[in-house]
Interface confidence: low
Amino acid sequence: SIQGTSLLTQSPASLSTYNDQSVSFVLENGCYVINVDDSGKDQEQDQVLLRYYESPCPASQSGDGVDGKKLMVNMSPIKDTDIWLHANDKDYSVELQRGDVSPPEQAFFVLHKKSSDFVSFECKNLPGTYIGVKDNQLALVEEKDESCNNIMFKLSKINPAFLYKVVGAADYKDDDDKAAHHHHHHHHHH
């Protein structure tokens, strides 16, 4: 666990977009880059390791969770789990970073269940900002319309019973007030 979050479980999954494009991780010049592209039917999809966390604090963001507690995830390529999917709030890019300390706040995403098939990932450090698809790349998207297709992702090869248990029933609908985003406060420990 880290900074007030407790690890529920971790599980591998492949990540694809609303339009069935695959999210893959390619090593180029010693660094991983993230690709979003069509994968052949017989092609093995890259997998991510998703770590699911439950925060003990009441949600300041409208994440789906258990007993009013928000559910957060962070993600690593299954082939290198010391690298984290990272929401860079300086240039609004989504990138893979290897950190010498535990993953920064930018590596945590509040999980929203959009339907029985789709989820979205809201940046913990940037409420109202989601991982989205722009020009065949992942980017940070400020999305007022939470039903927008480009922030919806499908997680496959994941235990559906677990997903159902922690994020609620498939026909779950966000309440209007739950969908409103509140200002996120940093907590200091001095």
């Epitope: 900074q3 010391d82 950190g99 535990s102 993953p103 920064p104």
Partner: antibody, heavy 117, light 108 residues
Framework: EVQLLESGGGLVQPGGSLRLSCAAS????????MSWVRQAPGKGLEWVSA????????YYADSVKGRFTISRDNSKNTLYLQMNSLRAEDTAVYYC??????????WGRGTLVTVSS | SYVLTQPPSVSVSPGQTARITCSGD??????AHWYQQKPGQAPALVIY???ERPSGIPERFSGSSSGTTVTLTISGVQAEDEADYYC???????????FGGGTKVTVL
């Protein structure tokens, strides 16, 4: 209140070994990344090593790689730095620090390591 | 290896404004954090994430960022602000932390 108390510093000959300890209190030690940062006399700060709660990952500055080993005992709330093959240039005050997300929010008072014959 | 560059020293009269710069190629993408160190003491955080001020730090301390340079500004400098100041950030890959060389602020 977060407290980090280093110990184990002292005078050692070149090529010798030393083990530093950092006793942590006032927070859930097992939940935080911890590091050692050093400062040679009259010089600037240098990041040395880090230990994360994630899969027990450890990281080292190039200057100490292969000679220093960071470890932690979560049951004792203690961080360690085993220093082998010490050199004169390792002479410094060694600080135990706690990370809060991407920055250091708490520092110990430091322990002096002197490598000299 | 990655380098963060700071001026070695800055001198300022009481009540004036001190500006300390920190330059590094990765700073458009990586946050910088600032630490104050007084003689014989451990460093203490004064600014994090380029511009954020921790609770307990006086309002006269502020941070800004532009391109490859971040700046720590001390407005209305007081005698107690005399100290060494260090910026810290990550290398371009995010793989390790780097400190700047430090800037000694002298209050005249």
């Amino acid at each position: 209140e977060v407290q980090l108390l280093e110990s184990g510093g002292g005078l050692v000959q070149p090529g010798g070994s030393l083990r530093l300890s950092c006793a942590a209190s006032g927070f859930t030690f097992s939940s935080y990344a911890m590091s050692w940062v050093r400062q040679a006399p009259g010089k600037g700060l240098e990041w040395v090593s880090a230990s994360t709660p994630w899969q027990g990952s450890t990281y080292y500055a190039d200057s100490v790689k292969g000679r220093f080993t960071i470890s932690r005992d979560n049951s004792k709330n203690t961080l360690y730095l085993q220093m082998n093959s010490l050199r004169a240039e390792d002479t410094a005050v060694y600080y135990c620090v706690r990370w809060y997300w991407g920055w250091i929010d708490s520092w110990g008072r430091g322990t002096l390591v002197t490598v000299s014959s | 290896s990655y380098v963060l560059t700071q001026p070695p020293s800055v001198s300022v009269s009481p009540g004036q404004t001190a500006r300390i710069t920190c330059s590094g190629d990765a700073l458009p993408k990586q946050y910088a954090h600032w630490y104050q160190q007084k003689p014989g003491q451990a460093p203490a955080l004064v600014i994090y994430k380029d511009t954020e001020r921790p609770s307990g730090i006086p309002e006269r301390f502020s941070g800004s960022s532009s391109g490859t340079t971040v700046t720590l500004t001390i407005s209305g400098v007081q005698a107690e602000d005399e100290a060494d100041y260090y910026c810290m950030s990550s290398d371009p890959s995010g793989a390790s932390r780097v400190f700047g060389g430090g800037t000694k602020v002298t209050v005249l």
